[in-house]
């Protein structure tokens, strides 16, 4: 058993039948000694009496609010949450694996520039009696600050039969070096609880791993004379590190219809403008990417060839 | 060209070929990407390894104050990845496919960092830890680190000439 | 699976116009761009120009701007490549060739061996 | 136009062994070169496309490098099947360009 924060207590179980579960001692928060009762949530029914109770935790029925009493006078609360081993793997019942880049993807982040700021996010299915709490470090033995605020829902989306709720963080280190190699990852922690259910999912990598740029901004045509090709131009986005002589980008301008099976024009550059073919009926679309270091493109930005 | 005595390197020269780094040290092993290796443990292997860090004088103003400290530390780094490059973790069992741009990308770090470093001036380098691992899946493995360390060196080092190309050529 | 056929060989006298015929099948027609690239014997490849079936656009290099003229039949799924005023260094293979995206060249036509000769 | 220059002009390579061919351009290019092989009374063959972009249906021993103004097709052993003449073509601005060619042949 473990404290999460004040008066809240994870007891962590062997999850499995007949399991003989934990024995938990709680203790009365108070200068008493004698008169105290135990209850266990709204009931009134006393578990038992004295400065400690002994109970032996095996499911969830054994979890929740305990509070010891005096004369009808509250004297002290413990919540009780569980964290489940099955198989030796810790349970991860609450949130939805997102399978991206790989199997057992919880939580997903992504960096718009080299600053120190990220963006983490997650999937469930639970609407209600859902809390999370984020903590991150750069490096775990000698850990460096960064500082998350609260995780919000983000979005909503029916799957089929099913609601999501994203919910997303966002993080800030707070001695940011952005022309650094990064040496040390950054860590990221995730405490869920559900009811009376507690997991805690993480995540580590390198800003320069997670790097997705804002789409290119100010897509501009300019056709050329006695030619089907256009001048496309386009400046870097605002959000992007600077100076841009040091962090450059490079890009992917793309002539396509509505469907990605028809045929398109596509042309790769480490300039802001690019000379294509336009068609009737088509977009002109550019993305980037960080010059150097094979992170992930951003979206595109999109204007019609017309 | 960058020496001790604190000239000018070739700017223009330099972000050509570290930028032709870049491109070979993840045609080298494109998939380390997607590779988690934090997972594998060993991370001792390769924290060893030079990294440009936050007082390197490697960031845009540190670059215009004095770039020599900088290019000093490129210099470092390349040298040592050039030699880990060439040692037994690269030669050794499992051979590297014939068609592997690691002999291509050992050449181009010696030759940026002779670039960086004409003959007959010598800044001190960094000494190599011993790393000689027993087993083909630990060289398999370490090979996956160091290259993957490398790809984010040159990202910075190819950061440094482009924004030296740009802004202190003379 | 996609295909090009090209018309046969031509012999052509200096001053003179040829049409090479290139018939794709296997695939929609107008879903793919259709570029003509020759070879001189003995010589490197050499970039003409391409046709968009699906509304006749055209864009020819310089060197074959005003001799050279790509038109479509789709009703035929059928690409022709016309050269006037003919010399004899224009005596080479032409080949058609098709693809999705428009600059590089992924389907080739067998060639068509076109020899200018007085 | 853009002038490409490959080099060697012809290369002499044992079956088994490793060819490694260069095409450059005389300004960036970015990643906009494709290579293709050419047997004798053949037409063009796509091999690689975007620099290193492999085609499904070419060995794998056929892999290309490169960016910005060098760019390396590499055969990593030669088969007698791969002895050809070898063109890389730019697409970076229009007109499209090929290189001079590289002929490989049996040492």
């Known amino acids: 058993i473990w404290e999460l924060k004040k008066d809240v207590y994870v007891v962590e179980l062997d999850w499995y039948p007949d399991a003989p579960g934990e024995m938990v001692v709680l203790t009365c928060d108070t200068p008493e000694e004698d008169g105290i009762t135990w209850t266990l949530d709204q009931s009134s029914e006393v578990l038992g009496s004295g400065k400690t109770l002994t109970i032996q935790v095996k499911e969830f029925g054994d979890a929740g609010q305990y509070t010891c009493h005096k004369g009808g006078e509250v004297l002290s609360h413990s919540l009780l949450l569980l964290h489940k081993k099955e198989d030796g793997i810790w349970s991860t019942d609450i949130l939805k694996d997102q399978k991206e880049p790989k199997n057992k993807t919880f939580l997903r982040c992504e960096a718009k520039n080299y600053s120190g700021r990220f963006t983490c996010w997650w999937l469930t299915t639970i609407s209600t009696d859902l809390t999370f709490s984020v903590k991150s470090s750069r490096g775990s033995s000698d850990p460096q600050g960064v500082t998350c605020g609260a995780a919000t829902l983000s979005a909503e989306r029916v799957r089929g039969d099913n609601k999501e709720y994203e919910y997303s963080v966002e993080c800030q280190e707070d001695s940011a070096c952005p022309a650094a190699e990064e040496s040390l990852p950054i860590e990221v922690m995730v405490d869920a609880v559900h009811k009376l259910k507690y997991e805690n999912y993480t995540s580590s990598f390198f800003i320069r791993d997670i790097i997705k740029p804002d789409p290119p901004k100010n897509l501009q045509l300019k056709p050329l004379k006695n030619s089907r090709q256009v001048e496309v131009s386009w400046e870097y986005p605002d959000t992007w590190s600077t100076p841009h002589s040091y962090f450059s980008l490079t890009f992917c301008v793309q002539v396509q219809g509505k469907s990605k099976r028809e045929k398109k024009d596509r042309v790769f550059t480490d300039k802001t403008s690019a000379t294509v073919i336009c068609r009737k009926n088509a977009s002109i679309s550019v993305r980037a990417q960080d010059r150097y270091y094979s992170s992930s493109w951003s979206e595109w930005a999109s204007v019609p060839c017309s | 060209r960058a020496v001790p005595g604190g000239s000018s390197p070739a700017w223009t020269q330099c972000q050509q070929l570290s930028q032709k780094l870049c491109t070979l040290a993840w045609s080298a092993h494109p998939l380390v990407g997607h590779m988690d290796l934090r997972e594998e443990g060993d991370e001792e292997t390769t924290n060893d390894v030079p990294h440009i860090q936050c007082g390197d004088g490697c960031d845009p103003q540190g670059l215009r104050d004095n770039s020599q400290f900088c290019l000093q530390r490129i210099h470092q780094g390349l040298i040592f990845y050039e030699k880990l490059l060439g040692s037994d973790i690269f030669t050794g069992e499992p051979s590297l496919l014939p068609d592997s741009p690691v002999g291509q990308l050992h050449a181009s770090l010696l030759g940026l960092s002779q670039l960086l470093q004409p003959e007959g001036h010598h800044w001190e380098t960094q000494q190599i830890p011993s790393l000689s691992p027993s087993q083909p899946w630990q060289r398999l493995l370490l090979r996956f680190k160091i290259l993957r360390s490398l790809q984010a060196f040159v990202a910075v080092a190819a950061r440094v000439f482009a924004h030296g190309a740009a802004t202190l050529s003379p | 699976q996609v295909q090009l056929v090209q018309s046969g060989a031509e012999v052509k006298k200096p001053g003179a116009s040829v049409k090479v015929s290139c018939k794709a099948s296997g695939y929609t027609f107008t879903d793919y761009y259709l570029h003509w690239v020759r070879q001189a014997p003995g010589q490197g490849l050499e970039w003409m120009g391409w046709i968009d079936p699906e509304n006749g656009d055209t864009e020819y290099a310089p060197k074959f701007q005003g001799r050279v003229t790509m038109t479509t039949d789709t009703s035929t799924s059928t690409a022709y490549m016309e050269l006037r005023s003919l010399r004899s260094d224009d005596t080479a293979v032409y080949y058609c060739n098709a693809n999705k995206e428009l600059r590089y060249f992924d389907v080739w036509g067998q060639g068509t061996m076109v020899t200018v000769s007085s | 136009e853009i002038v490409m220059t490959q080099s060697p002009a012809t290369l002499s390579v044992s079956p088994g062994e490793r060819a490694t061919l260069s095409c450059r351009a005389p300004?960036?290019?970015?990643?906009?070169l494709h290579w293709y092989q050419q047997k004798p009374g053949q037409a063009p063959r796509l091999l690689i496309y975007?620099?290193?972009q492999s085609i499904s249906g070419i060995p794998a021993r056929f892999s290309g490098s490169g960016s910005g103004t060098e760019f390396t097709l590499t055969i990593s052993s030669l088969q007698s099947e791969d002895f050809a003449v070898y063109y890389c073509?730019?697409?970076?601005?229009?007109?499209?360009?090929f290189g001079g060619g590289t002929k490989v042949e049996i040492k």
């Open positions: 300004q960036s290019i970015s990643i906009n």
């Open positions: 975007f620099a290193s």
């Open positions: 073509q730019q697409s970076n601005s229009f007109p499209l360009t």
